[in-house]
């Protein structure tokens, strides 16, 4: 269960790794307790959601992430099943790790 | 800035239903997980549920049967609801906005007391 | 459900000292543990999140350590603004709150 941010250390592009690819995460329902799961994941505290972030390429792994904001990991989430998504690159989500 | 406030009534009869608003500024309810919190009189706080995401609902196990969250996002507001209220009931009655479980900002109270 | 025991329940101390709450968990919590100060008429404050971040607006003498099932909050130079309740906090499962440590000035 590996994820990285694309952009920056701790803000840019959030993307996860999934069937030996990377793919990025589309916007849909995403809010700060998904960002933050996902940052926790990364060894931050807390996270910031950032919508359309976009710039990402390939597959488009996980749409409308519904995190309690207490889980240990994102596959631990409410989701669409891996790469069953209505959306495009420009609505991939972003974050913002502290 | 950040504000949330607790508003209903003050004294509640035993057996009856008690209804709460929470109402917020400054944040979007669905950036956010809105929980309840309650402290009876000289106790200690005790969580009572979460409203959070897609309108999902979170509820502390031992009230779950009494209780019920919602939320109108348009009203930036969210309602509780607990219906067979005993004077065990009676606390102080906190709102306060959850991020990744940590209670980062809180209403000042309403004191509720179920009485006859 | 997860129980949280805080030690001491009061703590009385004086303008200076170092002071050293406990909490402890019956099982492993992670690091999601959180600190919250409440004075007398008021609503609590976010102190300490996630086992050691300081919230923003907090000052420097309040901090936070601990894993697994040990925790403490540490105050390193006691203020007369001190004087609170202080509850421990988890969220790795279920939530629930210590049953607090009053601190008083001696």
């Known amino acids: 269960q590996r994820v990285r941010i694309m952009g920056g250390t701790n803000r840019g592009r959030a993307e996860v790794y999934y069937n030996n690819e990377w793919g990025t995460i589309c916007d849909d329902d995403w809010d700060n307790n998904d960002a933050t799961v996902f940052c926790r994941m990364l060894g931050y505290s807390r996270g910031r959601a950032l919508s359309s972030y976009g710039g990402g390429s390939g597959n488009i792994w996980l749409d409308n992430v519904n995190c309690r904001g207490t889980e240990n990991s994102l596959w631990d989430c409410s989701k669409n099943s891996w790469g069953n998504h209505n959306c495009v690159h420009n609505e991939d989500a972003g974050v913002e790790c502290s | 800035q950040v504000q949330l406030k607790e508003s209903g009534p003050g004294l509640v009869q035993p057996s009856q239903t008690l209804s709460l608003t929470c109402t917020v500024s400054g944040f979007s309810l669905t950036s956010y997980t809105l929980s309840w919190v309650r402290q009876p009189p000289g106790k200690g706080l005790e969580w009572i549920g979460a409203?959070?995401?897609?309108?999902?609902?979170d509820y502390n196990s031992a009230l779950k049967s009494r209780l019920s969250i919602s939320r109108d996002t348009s009203k930036s507001q969210v309602l509780l609801k607990m219906n067979s209220l005993q004077t065990e009931d009676t606390a102080i009655y906190f709102c306060?906005?959850?991020?990744?479980?940590?209670?980062?900002?809180w209403g000042q109270g309403v004191m509720v007391t179920v009485s006859s | 459900d997860i129980q949280m025991t805080q030690s001491p329940p009061v703590l009385s101390a004086s303008v200076g000292d170092r002071v050293t709450l406990s909490c402890k968990t019956s099982?492993?919590?992670?690091?999601?543990l959180d600190w919250y100060q409440q004075k007398h008429g008021e609503a609590p404050k976010l102190l300490i999140y996630?086992?050691?971040n300081l919230q923003t607006g907090i000052p420097s003498r309040f901090s936070g350590s601990g894993s697994g099932t040990d925790f403490t909050l540490t105050i390193s130079t006691l203020q007369p603004e001190d004087v609170a309740t202080y509850y421990c906090y988890q969220y790795d499962s279920g939530f629930t709150f210590g049953a607090g440590t009053k601190l008083e000035l001696k």
């Open positions: 306060t906005r959850e991020l990744g479980g940590s209670f980062d900002y």
């Open positions: 099982q492993n919590i992670n690091k999601k």
């Open positions: 409203i959070w995401g897609g309108d999902n609902t």
């Open positions: 996630y086992t050691n």
